[in-house]
């Protein structure tokens, strides 16, 4: 079976994947929106804000097929991808325009799923095998969480769901995807 690519509403090409897409990769190109060109945070943006509304998290819709071994969903499903780093909302548009991206040098901020929804899909199989019904877990919304280093980089601190919504009137821009991401394996990735 070949790679079937299709577009989402942010004009991003997404390969066909299994139940769960590969987590968004850490992009190596330091001029992408997920990296500061010179690393660290600029001194005039001290990391002291306590206002959750100052933090923004990007939600991109994308469409994919669900696979289970040789079987594939009759229709594609649409879900969200929680995009990259979180930073103060007031800095996001301008920072991108300058080719800069705010990123704290201390705690790491992650844009990760906030809520999931279940959707039943019908999987069609080759060779006359009976269709299979599966219920898949799809990302329904995203939020910013803080990753603190004193927790072995594994404990995520929730900034709350209020920070999870993209700002109104600003359509998310497509994320650059690395070659590695586009070569994600097509397997029965549940």
């Amino acid at each position: 079976q070949g790679w079937q690519a299709f577009k989402n509403d942010a004009t991003e090409i997404i390969p066909e994947l299994g139940e769960y897409p590969e987590p968004p990769p850490e992009l190596e190109n330091n001029k992408t929106m997920n990296r500061a060109e010179n690393g660290g945070r600029p001194p005039h943006h001290p990391f002291e804000t306590k206002d959750v509304s100052e933090y923004s998290c990007r939600e991109l819709h994308f469409t994919r097929y669900v696979t289970d071994g040789p079987c594939r969903s009759a229709k594609p499903v649409t879900e969200l991808v929680c995009s990259g780093q979180c930073g103060p909302a007031r800095l996001l548009p301008n920072a991108i325009g300058r080719g800069k991206w705010w990123r704290p040098s201390g705690p790491d901020f992650r844009c990760i799923p906030d809520r999931y929804r279940a959707q039943r899909v019908q999987l069609l199989c080759p060779g006359g095998e009976a269709p299979r019904a599966r219920k898949v877990r799809l990302v329904a919304s995203c939020k910013c969480k803080r990753l603190t280093r004193f927790h072995n980089q594994s404990e995520l601190k929730d900034f709350g769901t209020e920070a999870a919504r993209p700002q109104k009137g600003r359509k998310p821009r497509p994320r650059a995807r690395s070659a590695k991401a586009n070569q994600a394996e097509l397997e029965n990735a549940y």
């Epitope: 769960y20 590969e22 987590p23 999931y116 279940a118 019904a133 599966r134 990302v139 969480k145 397997e187």
Partner: antibody, heavy 116, light 111 residues
Framework: QVQLVESGGGLVQPGGSLRLSCAAS????????LSWVRQAPGKGLEWVSV???????YYADSVKGRFTISRDNSKNTLYLQMNSLRAEDTAVYYC??????????WGQGTLVTVSS | DIALTQPASVSGSPGQSITISCTGT?????????VSWYQQHPGKAPKLMIY???NRPSGVSNRFSGSKSGNTASLTISGLQAEDEADYYC???????????FGGGTKLTVL
């Protein structure tokens, strides 16, 4: 074939810490949700924690604030850091792969004994 | 999440059929396609026997079947065999899809 192998269990005193590991092979690790499930001696199964493919983590109320689940996709390994251990945490701990909202593969388990 | 309720034990003779029930609230088993069953022999890891209420993984005997009516899911084993003697657990997920709940387990004895 899919394999999950737990390690790191042992005897620890109440209040102590332990880190369990689960080495995975035979599937694309980063694309799957993974859980820890435990079973106290002579008792039933109890779900402990799960990590999603995007780094999100979730816990049973009984371990929240004491246990931390994490994954290293580069090493195909799942971890469970257990702090402030109590006698009631004594159990065999299994890691399990979450497939379409059920567990299709389980490790053989590792025994954690909390006793003074 | 509220625990799922199973009978502590059931028994049957070889060749007979038995049914193990699993009852919960609507958020646990009231939704379609969300109950799985696991078999566990003493000292062994659990093994998935039924998923999505009534689907069998490859390699599981067709003597095992699942069903659901209202808030009660059931596992039926037909043509009982000695090797079926084990503990059986039902399981479902929480409303958030990020937590799980198991039944208390049922010990099956083949007489």
């Amino acid at each position: 074939q899919v394999q999950l192998v737990e390690s790191g269990g042992g005897l620890v005193q109440p209040g102590g810490s332990l880190r369990l590991s689960c080495a995975a092979s035979g599937f694309t690790f980063r694309s799957h949700w993974l859980s820890w499930v435990r079973q106290a001696p002579g008792k039933g199964l109890e779900w402990v924690s799960v990590t999603g493919v995007h780094g999100d983590t979730y816990y049973a109320d009984s371990v929240k604030g004491r246990f931390t689940i994490s994954r290293d996709n580069s090493k195909n390994t799942l971890y469970l850091q257990m702090n402030s251990l109590r006698a009631e945490d004594t159990a065999v701990y299994y890691c399990a792969r979450d497939t379409y909202l059920h567990f299709d593969y389980w490790g053989q388990g590792t025994l954690v004994t909390v006793s003074s | 999440d509220i625990a799922l309720t199973q009978p502590a034990s059931v028994s049957g003779s070889p060749g007979q059929s038995i049914t193990i029930s699993c009852t919960g609230t609507s958020s646990d088993v009231g939704d379609i396609n969300d109950v799985s069953w696991y078999q566990q022999h003493p000292g062994k890891a659990p093994k998935l026997m039924i998923y999505d209420v009534n689907n069998r993984p490859s390699g599981v005997s067709n003597r095992f079947s699942g069903s659901k009516s209202g808030n009660t899911a059931s596992l039926t084993i037909s043509g009982l065999q000695a090797e079926d003697e084990a503990d059986y657990y039902c399981s479902s997920y929480g409303e958030s899809l990020t937590s799980y709940v198991f039944g208390g387990g049922t010990k099956l004895t083949v007489l």
